[in-house]
């Protein structure tokens, strides 16, 4: 979902960290949504 940045070597070198960060933020968002849902 970030096609243009793939031309930058930095993107390649940080890819694993980027994926981890995105997975983590998705988990946090899902947990936040669950908390909100549970409180309704």
């Amino acid at each position: 979902d970030n096609p243009s940045l793939s031309i930058d070597l930095t993107f390649h070198l940080l890819r694993t960290l980027l994926e981890l960060a995105r997975t983590q933020s998705q988990r946090e968002r899902a947990e936040q949504n669950r908390i909100i849902f549970d409180s309704v």
Epitope: L5, L9, T10, L13
Partner: antibody, heavy 118, light 112 residues
């Protein structure tokens, strides 16, 4: 041609914050990560962190985590680096830099001298 | 963190003669993709750093062919075949294979 133009020199008191800007031109700003490197007087180079201007992903050198904030304003192709709780040993020239598909620091700004003194 | 150790700290040279700078990494800097992201930068007095070499031995565009890089694993070298006056300054090696990215302490090339 690729150009990175930084803001002017700053003098700050210990405990204050400083925000350095880096205006990019000559390429599509969102196509390349922006890095920040600093150099204390007479010392070597130290990588501070990197920001993805497209999606805002940021990776900081742990040494600066909690004191440094990197942001971008895509509308004016400008990256910012803010360093808080300044100490005298933060006196340094701060550089922004951009890579290519082959190397990490191919293009550099002219540097911004930040002096921390009481 | 990967410590990058350069030697010598200072390198007095005679113009027209060769010069060699060594850079050793505290651990292997071969990336998981098989590449070695070892770069060399030149910093002339009062100027911003300038990229010379990337991935150990590749000259960046506009860099004169008197500059060459070599090495593997943990041992790397930057060579200047014939030093010119414009080559005086500080040279830094850098590794981008492991986070945090780290620079060597620098080698100052000066007139003997």
């Amino acid at each position: 041609q690729v150009q990175l133009v930084q803001s002017g020199a700053e003098v700050k008191k210990p405990g204050a914050s400083v925000k350095v800007s880096c205006k990019a031109s000559g390429y599509t700003f969102t196509d390349y990560f922006m890095k920040w490197v600093r150099q204390a007087p007479g010392q070597g180079l130290e990588w501070m962190g990197v920001i993805n201007p497209n999606q805002g992903d940021i990776f900081y050198n742990q040494k600066f985590k909690g004191r440094v904030t990197m942001t971008v304003d895509k509308s004016i192709s400008t990256a910012y680096m803010e360093l808080s709780r300044l100490r005298s040993d933060d006196t340094a020239v701060y550089y922004c830099a951009r890579g290519t598909d082959r190397a990490l620091f191919a293009y550099w700004g002219q540097g911004t001298l930040v002096t921390v003194s009481s | 963190d990967v410590v990058m150790t350069q030697s010598p700290l200072s390198l007095p040279v005679t113009l027209g003669q060769p010069a060699s700078i060594s850079c050793r990494s505290g651990q292997s800097i071969v990336h998981s993709d098989g590449n070695t992201y070892l770069e060399w930068y030149q910093q002339r007095p009062g100027q911003s750093p300038r990229l010379l070499i990337y991935k150990v031995s590749n000259r960046f565009s506009g860099v004169p062919d008197r500059f060459s890089g070599s090495g593997s694993g943990t041992d790397f070298t930057l060579k200047i075949s014939r030093v010119e006056a414009e080559d005086l300054g500080v040279y830094y090696c850098f590794q981008g294979s492991h986070i945090p990215w780290t620079f060597g302490g620098g080698t100052k090339v000066e007139i003997k």
